[in-house]
């Protein structure tokens, strides 16, 4: 059962796992949600009736029954983890805490103009978990405007105290706001020889990398595969750090793999969701339950639905035994990972999918597309929407992309002459325009947010957000696309597609069926040569074949240039402008979405 509200002046008795410090009960709830075992918590707020050493304590708790006895206590705030909830969860915390000093290891001290600048510095520093900033009103002259970057083993403060004229806050890495590089490569036959901060068992290097990503201190990892010569180290995932933030030594060793934390790319790839099945593999751990199940998929469902289950092993039924049902062992451990991994026993193992909701919805794999041909199939581009205008008659105006359950990203130039959002309708899950009848459901538009630097498409800033009047329920035919990670600026995308209902030649009509075309990206230098009369800025991205032939055209504006990278689709561009359509040496010009991630997040996360 999902309980989101906080219980004031209430304390949960017993069940303690660990105590951390958080600046608010709300953040305590987030910490509890992300902890592998925490189901309930009790937070102590500042209060004259409480011992100041207990202020800001966040006690994480577990219970076999998923609840604990309640006791009345002033200043105590209790609640439940969001593990029990189906809604999307984010660790992003933009709050600034006034007059609070969050204690940790102060490893960097510098002058900053503002708390915001200090927070940005923390976000862009690989080690920083949180910061404290002394304002210009701080009594001690030499400490004024000092920005202290801090880290701890847990990622949360070791203590929080009241201190006048300072402000504290957290790194915004989990808000996708870091400019740090996103290195997704996994290096085979490589060991990073740096200090280990922790070690866990993992079935493969990908899971190891994802564990590293959500471990607060892990910057890179080394994984020993099941073929590793030393038996006791097989399937061992070593979580590592270094002062420089990079591995100091790389040793060539067969059957080992190494890689980096995906902290700077976590909004565009799954880091919590371990969805694969591991055949002929048994996960050991504390047994929660043994249930009969028809298949390993059914076993995974059972684990996902049991809030305390972290991983499972399924043993298939022996011929015609137990109505063809096998045994499903639901398991847990202190850190969410198996205590040991064994091979060759015939089991099929995997993890709960409950953690998938901690990842962005956009990272969900969509059904395989049919390559070749220009007409799309249903569900192939589930983020693509058709934006209609109803005045004076209803028709398709532009494309757009679902980027959140209330947000469509599109082009600013689509709204030339549009005097009110009331005349707009957003249709999602549409393949053919002919499906749209008078009674077809649509999303009304509450607000059109156009970039304030937009003047005309050809000079850039051709980007706009539509806030929908109601929320989109995600299904196979309507779901969001990931925004590119700022850390991915240097990624070379090779699998890019433009989609829309636009013309197939310059003078044509809107197509009935959603069209698709695979189009290669073109460097900005090359693009600039093709548009000498224009300034192709870094906020634009171009795509096209030198010989022409495939391109976006009229009616595709605002729609996506979608690029697949590491099995996840990213919204790399927004169809904007170009000379003619599909002309030789005239690439299409798109809004370069990665350059607007901050703007998008600022507008969509505004209170």
């Amino acid at each position: 059962e999902c309980v989101t509200q906080l219980l004031k002046d209430t304390c949960f008795e017993g069940g303690d796992i660990t105590t951390v410090f958080t600046p608010s009960a709300k953040y305590c709830q987030v910490v509890c949600t992300y902890h592998p075992r925490c189901l309930l918590f009790t937070f102590t707020a500042e209060s004259p009736s409480e011992d100041p050493t207990r202020w800001f304590t966040c006690v994480l708790k577990d219970s076999v029954t998923e609840t604990l006895p309640r006791v009345n206590r002033t200043a105590a705030i209790s609640g439940y983890s969001f593990k029990q909830c189906s809604h999307q969860i984010s660790a992003c915390n933009k709050d600034i805490y006034v007059d609070l000093d969050m204690k940790g290891i102060n490893y960097n001290s510098s002058v900053a103009k503002s708390a915001q600048e200090c927070q940005e510095r923390c976000t862009d520093d690989v080690h920083c978990h949180f910061f404290t900033y002394a304002t210009r009103q701080f009594p001690s002259l030499e400490h004024r405007n000092i920005c202290l970057l801090k880290h701890t083993q847990t990622g949360t403060p070791t203590r929080i105290t009241k201190l006048d004229k300072v402000v504290s806050g957290f790194s915004l890495k989990s808000c996708a706001l870091s400019n740090l590089a996103c290195i997704r490569d996994i290096f085979p036959n490589t060991v990073f020889a740096d200090s280990n901060i922790d070690s866990v068992m993992a079935p493969d290097a990908f899971v190891c990398g994802r564990i590293c990503t959500h471990h607060p201190g892990c910057l890179f990892f080394t994984f020993f595969s099941q073929e590793w010569p030393k038996e006791s180290q097989r399937n061992l995932c070593l979580l590592k750090t270094s002062e420089s933030g990079l591995p100091s030594t790389r040793i060539k060793k067969s059957k080992a793999l190494s890689g980096f934390s995906l902290q700077s790319c976590r909004h565009s790839i799954p880091v919590f969701c371990h969805s694969s099945f591991y055949h002929d593999t048994d996960f050991l751990g504390e047994e929660l339950d043994i249930v009969a199940a028809k298949s390993h998929e059914a076993c995974q469902k059972l684990c996902t639905n049991a809030v305390r289950c972290q991983f499972f092993t399924y043993t298939p039924a022996q011929a015609s035994c137990n109505e063809g049902k096998g045994k499903c062992y639901l398991k847990l451990s202190s850190n969410g990972s198996p205590t040991k991994i064994l091979h060759g026993r015939g089991g099929i193992s995997g993890y709960t999918l409950r953690l998938c909701k901690m990842d962005n919805e956009c990272t969900t794999k969509i059904k395989p597309r049919i390559v070749g041909g220009t007409a799309s199939v249903r569900g192939e581009w589930p983020w693509q929407v058709t934006l209609h205008t109803t005045s004076p008659t209803q028709r398709h105006l532009c494309g757009g992309s679902i980027i959140g359950n209330q947000w469509i990203l599109t082009a600013a130039h689509c709204f030339y002459g549009v005097e009110s959002p009331k005349i707009l309708r957003v249709y999602s899950g549409i393949l053919n325009q002919s499906e749209i009848k008078e009674d077809t459901s649509f999303f009304g538009v509450q607000e059109i947010i156009i970039h304030d630097q937009y003047k005309m498409a050809e000079s850039g800033y051709d980007i706009a957000l539509l806030k929908l009047e109601t929320t989109v329920n995600y299904t196979d035919s309507q779901r969001p696309i990931c925004l590119p990670s700022k850390g991915d600026r240097n990624v070379i995308y090779t699998d890019c597609w433009v989609t829309g209902w636009g013309y197939r030649k310059l003078r044509d009509k809107i197509q009935n069926t959603l069209q698709k075309a695979k189009i290669p990206l073109v460097t900005n230098e090359e693009c600039q040569k093709r548009y000498r009369g224009h300034k192709i800025t870094h906020k634009m991205i171009c795509a096209g074949y030198r010989e022409g032939g495939k391109d976006a055209c009229k009616g595709d504006s605002g729609g996506p240039l979608s690029c697949k990278h590491n099995e996840v689709w990213h919204l790399v561009g927004i169809t904007s402008w170009g000379e003619g359509c599909a002309q030789r040496e005239r690439p299409g010009v798109y809004t370069n979405v990665v350059e607007y991630v901050d703007w998008i997040l600022e507008k969509t996360q505004a209170v």
């Epitope: 105006l397 005309m456 498409a457 009509k509 009369g533 009229k554 595709d556 002309q583």
Partner: antibody, heavy 124, light 107 residues
């Protein structure tokens, strides 16, 4: 202020040549398709020619094809119409106009800015 | 070429009255149609683009409708400054064509 200013008109004998210019100001010239439209005395508007933003594509009315050449110099923000083998029926006020064509929404934006016109008289 | 035919050639109305001007294309031009107003001795001025969208600064009494081959320009309540010649123009074909014009005169 967005402006188009035609020049180069005048009196010319049949078979003669004339070069019209249109100086653009107040907007990014290289972003717009440009065109020439003429109006014979007491008659309606007649489209003459159009040119794409880069100058790579040109179109002409059948009545002027092979005799007139449209061109542009984006570095000078200027549109040209070279008129050769002029005939009496080419006598008209010649207007230059701009047209927004580069955005990829399906709307036709029309010729939204016009010059004041320059008069061409072809007579012996 | 696509022929554009406007009717009537002349329309005589009084201020305050409603004016309805027609334009027919010899084949479909989708919504690639614009309307222009030309007052005596002046350059043409864009009124309606994309068949039905009012250009910047054009009063709300002007409206356009239609798509395909049949189009209409309506002036809901004529003002003295509206008496002028009106042209429709298609750009669906790369050979642009104008209608012959409708002269709107004071009755």
């Amino acid at each position: 202020e967005v402006q188009l200013l035609e020049s180069g008109g005048g009196l010319v004998q049949p078979g003669g040549s004339l070069r019209l210019s249109c100086a653009a100001s107040g907007f990014t010239f290289s972003t717009y398709s440009m065109g020439w439209v003429r109006q014979a005395p007491g008659k309606g508007l007649e489209w003459v020619s159009s040119i794409s933003p880069s100058g790579g594509d040109t179109d002409y009315a059948d009545s002027v094809k092979g005799r007139f050449t449209i061109s542009r110099d984006n570095s000078k923000n200027t549109l040209y119409l070279q008129m050769n083998s002029l005939r009496a029926e080419d006598t008209a006020v010649y207007y230059c106009a701009r047209e927004r064509t580069m955005v990829r929404d399906p709307r036709y934006y029309g010729m939204d800015v016009w010059g004041q016109g320059t008069t061409v008289t072809v007579s012996s | 070429d696509i022929q554009m035919t406007q009717s009537p050639a002349t329309l005589s109305l009084s201020p305050g009255e409603r004016a309805t001007l027609s334009c027919r294309a010899s084949q479909s031009v989708s919504s690639y149609l614009a309307w222009y107003q030309q007052r005596l001795g002046q350059s043409p001025r864009l009124l309606i683009y994309d068949a039905s969208s009012r250009a910047t600064g054009i009063p709300a009494r002007f409206s356009g409708s239609g798509s395909g081959t049949d189009f209409t320009l309506t002036i809901s309540s004529l003002q003295p400054e509206d008496f002028a010649t009106y042209y429709c123009q298609q750009s669906y074909s790369n050979l642009v064509t104008f209608g012959q014009g409708t002269r709107l005169e004071i009755k």
